[in-house]
């Protein structure tokens, strides 16, 4: 990698520049695609900042750009114009360029701020020269609002700095009135005033009447040392408008302002609803509006005019239509500061707001809104509803288009069919069920941001309160006993008062659930169950008989149960039990109750009998450890043989 | 605020239905979440009937579902409750209510 | 469904007595409670919604508390307008039932 370029950039005070490829210039012996050249940002600006133009221009610090960006004149330097005066400012920026497998550079961008420079923006090199407004016929002080050279004193180091002064040297005098300093009349013998007399209020204008024509003085401005010495240093040739008022003039009343709404990369036109103003005294043509800052998100332009950016126009530009904003790919808002004025009264502040608004939204879904059952609700997060567009959108608001089946929406404790994000996110949305005949629902919401709406549904599922076993694998062939180590809604029970019950959904693929009966002179083998309650379970009186998959080879293999958990006051749950079995082994201890085991062990054993479940499984029942973990088939045998 | 406000005959004849509308202003019948009828018979307690929410599904009173049909008219703001097969147990105030807000009522007497 | 039981039936109190009415569910509702004032000839008026949430408007001397299966109505200081009877209505499970009422009389 190589980097060419002057890495030096001059930026005017308080402007924006971007970075150029005369600035900045990476290449790669192996002609790498721009794109793929990157710099990040060691160390940012300290007198600005670095931003992107089609990104966020008043958040996050730029970290990381390219020099595909950079050729294309998307990466900007703004410099913030500090509270204190200076006339020259430096700033540094360090990067890291880097495009593997290339070894990373470092770089450093040098940032010069200057008055010095010629500066299409800001045609006065003086900290301020914003001119004069003044009454037919009347005087008016000219303050250091409105003429301020404290930058060339800036120059100066601070410790000499009071020893100093600026001359000011007026080389054309006002042609319609006279300047007084300390109500002595300046003229061409006593030309000078200082920056000094500016400051402690004693330059005044004095206007001689006779209409109300332009007036004005040239000057010229340099720096003076101690005993009125002329010392080396900054100067500047500039002039200094005064604006004469009617007496009689209403200056114009600016009216409240609409922000205007615009997609990105679209065009607009302007309206009175944006930019107008009550004056009696002028015609719209006479109405003149500059523009003082434009925003990042696009610019100004006259139907009819250039292509380009416009920084002048008129009431009547307005009101015919022709002003439009044209929006680049911005997504951010925006605010035009403006001065207006009638070109008879001082120019009045305005701003004119642009709010980009996305072109579509997006409403994300992460997760269903899981409802625990006992508690029968559930809030609302961003992992169920989060809008996004160009941007995340923290203003969003949704409208509840179908409300849930089996539930409601309430904010607050309320039911409501309408809430924000910021309701969403500070957890104040909840589903409650209602009904509780169900173990799912689904709602649906309009989402609103930024002008634009997007739908979207959001589903919601019941988390069972069930303990579920979860350890190795059973045997096929076998029929253990279903009891409250396996499966287990005790906690449901208690927080309830109520017996859980269940339903059998689905499953074993292998096998079935059956009801053991309760001693050898119980009628009957044992019975299929498709319900049971935990009350069953506790009794012991549930076996699932694992089958053997049909049609191979015996072998490990996976399977399931789905159960629908009920229980009073609360929603229904759908859960799983999965389980894992494989061939009987007589040796391996099981970690579960045993109620019968496959008919071929037996026989091997020397004990034919048949493979229906054993009756009560006598002391193994109340046994904490099941008997077949003891010791294998014999440990079996011994819990088994007098049952 | 929602104001509500119920309107409809005073006097059902036996075994007739009972129908009471309910005029919404102030708010939407699409944006408020429950629109409910409530009864409260004389003297008495009172009596959930059914709701009709903003998306226009109901819910009704199992004691009640087989005789109680409760729809809306979107484009008048307004909500109705008919009641078959009346009998003089059905005798009371009828009010409609968001929960929030409530009508003063109309007394409803099933009387030959 | 769920039942509602208040209790007292009715009380006797003076202006300036503490009042305090309870409401008891028949399986918890999960403080989805709303308490209403009624007088005679009038529709019940909205006191407190979700057990102890004022609804606007009304004085801060009424107060609600509760979870589970009990909940409380208190009147602070009770004022010569707040003679009336008290309902509670769940809003927990459908169909949504109201309390018997609790009258409260000028003693």
């Known amino acids: 990698l190589s980097l060419e370029g002057s890495r030096t950039l001059t930026v005017c005070p308080g402007s924006v520049q971007p970075l150029s490829s005369q600035t900045l210039r990476a290449s790669s012996s192996a002609g790498t695609d721009p794109q793929l050249l990157l710099y990040r940002v060691v160390r940012g600006p300290q007198l600005g900042r670095l931003f992107h133009a089609q990104q966020d221009s008043t958040g996050e610090a730029l970290v990381n750009f390219t020099q595909a960006e950079v050729y294309a004149g998307n990466i900007l330097y703004e410099h913030e114009m500090p509270t204190e005066p200076f006339w020259e400012a430096h700033d540094t920026l360090e990067l890291q360029l880097s495009s593997p497998p290339a070894r990373d550079v470092a770089a450093t961008l040098a940032v010069a701020v200057s008055f010095e420079a010629a500066c299409p923006q800001r045609p006065s090199h003086l900290w301020k020269n914003k001119g004069l407004w003044v009454p037919e016929g009347q005087r008016a002080k000219i303050t250091m609002a409105a003429l301020d050279a404290s930058n060339l004193l800036a120059s100066v180091p601070s410790p000499q700095r009071l020893e100093h002064d600026v001359l000011f040297q007026v080389t054309q005098f006002p042609s319609r009135g006279q300047l007084l300093v300390s109500e002595e009349p300046l003229h061409a013998g006593q030309p000078h005033f200082l920056q000094s007399q500016l400051a402690a209020g004693q330059l005044v204008y004095a206007h001689g009447g006779g209409g109300t024509q332009q007036d004005g003085f040239h000057f010229r401005a340099h720096l003076q040392g101690p005993a009125g010495a002329t010392v080396a240093g900054p100067q500047t040739s500039e002039a200094f408008a005064i604006t004469v008022r009617d007496v009689n003039e209403r200056p114009p009343q600016p009216q409240a302002s609409v922000p205007l709404r615009i997609t990105r990369g679209s065009r607009a036109p302007i309206s009175r609803a944006q930019l107008s103003v009550v004056d009696p005294d002028s015609a719209p043509g006479e109405i003149e509006y500059e523009v003082q800052r434009a925003p990042h998100n696009g610019f100004l332009s006259l139907v009819g005019g250039g292509p380009g950016p416009v920084t002048h126009f008129t009431q009547a530009d307005v009101d015919s239509g022709r002003l439009a904003f044209v929006a680049n790919g911005s997504s951010v808002a925006g605010v035009f500061q403006l001065s207006m004025s009638d070109g008879a009264s001082p120019p009045l502040p305005m701003s004119l707001a642009v709010d980009i608004l996305p072109s579509a939204i997006e409403v994300q879904l992460q997760a269903p809104l899981e409802v625990p059952q006992a508690l029968g609700r559930s809030s609302l997060s961003q992992q169920q509803l989060r809008v996004v567009s160009d941007r995340e959108e923290p203003e969003a608001a949704y409208r509840l288009i179908q409300g849930p089946k089996y539930g409601h929406l309430l904010v607050g404790g309320r039911p409501a069919s309408a809430f924000s994000q910021l309701q969403i996110d500070q957890g104040e949305v909840v589903f409650a069920f209602t009904n509780f005949s169900s173990s799912h629902d689904h709602f649906r919401v309009l989402a609103l941001a930024r002008g634009v709406n997007a739908s979207a549904v959001v589903n919601i599922t019941v988390r069972a309160l069930l303990h579920v076993w979860a350890g190795g694998p059973w045997p096929q062939g076998a029929t253990l006993r279903l009891d409250p180590t396996i499966l287990d809604a005790g906690e449901l029970a208690n927080r309830t008062g109520s017996v859980p019950h269940f339903r059998l959904l689905e499953g074993p693929r292998h096998g079935r659930v059956v009801r053991v009966p309760r001693a050898r002179t119980e009628p009957g083998g044992s019975q299929l169950v498709e319900q049971f309650t935990q009350q069953d379970l506790e009794d012991g009186r549930l076996g699932l008989e694992v089958g053997r998959p049909e049609g191979r080879a015996p072998s490990p293999t996976g399977d399931s149960l789905t159960l629908e958990l009920w229980a009073q006051g609360v929603p229904p749950a759908v859960a799983s039990l999965d389980f894992a079995t494989e061939p009987y082994n007589a040796a391996r201890p099981y970690s579960v109750a045993l109620l019968s085991v496959p008919e071929a062990t037996r026989m091997e054993a020397g004990k034919p009998e048949s493979s229906t479940p054993t009756g009560e499984p006598g002391p193994m029942a109340s046994s904490p450890v099941p008997a077949v973990a003891k010791g294998g088939f014999l440990g079996f045998l011994e819990a088994n043989m007098f049952s | 605020q929602v104001q509500l406000q119920e309107s409809g005959p005073g006097l059902v004849k036996p075994s007739q239905t009972l129908s009471l509308t309910c005029t919404v202003s102030g708010g939407s019948i699409t944006s408020g979440y429950y629109w409910n009828w409530i009864r409260q018979h004389p003297g008495k307690g009172l009596e959930w009937i059914g709701y009709i929410t903003f998306d226009g599904s109901n819910n009704y009173n199992p004691s009640l579902k087989s005789r109680v049909t409760i729809s809306r008219d979107t484009s008048k703001n307004q909500f109705s409750l008919k009641l078959s097969s009346v009998t003089a147990a059905d005798t009371a105030v009828y009010y409609c209510?968001?929960?929030?807000?409530w009508g003063q009522g109309t007394l409803v007497t099933v009387s030959s | 469904d769920i039942q509602m039981t208040q209790s007292p039936s009715s009380l006797s109190a003076s202006v300036g007595d503490r009042v305090t009415i309870t409401c008891r569910a028949s399986?918890?509702?999960?403080?989805?409670l709303n308490w209403y004032q009624q007088k005679p000839g009038k529709a019940p008026k909205l006191l407190i919604y979700?057990?102890?949430s004022l609804h606007s408007g009304v004085p801060s001397r009424f107060s609600g508390s509760g979870s589970g299966t009990d909940y409380t109505l208190t009147i602070s200081s009770l004022q010569p307008e707040d003679f009336a009877t008290y309902y509670c209505q769940q809003y927990s499970a459908l169909p949504w039932t109201f309390g018997q009422g609790t009258k409260v009389e000028i003693k």
């Open positions: 979700y057990t102890s």
């Open positions: 209510a968001d929960f929030d807000y």
């Open positions: 399986q918890g509702i999960r403080n989805y």
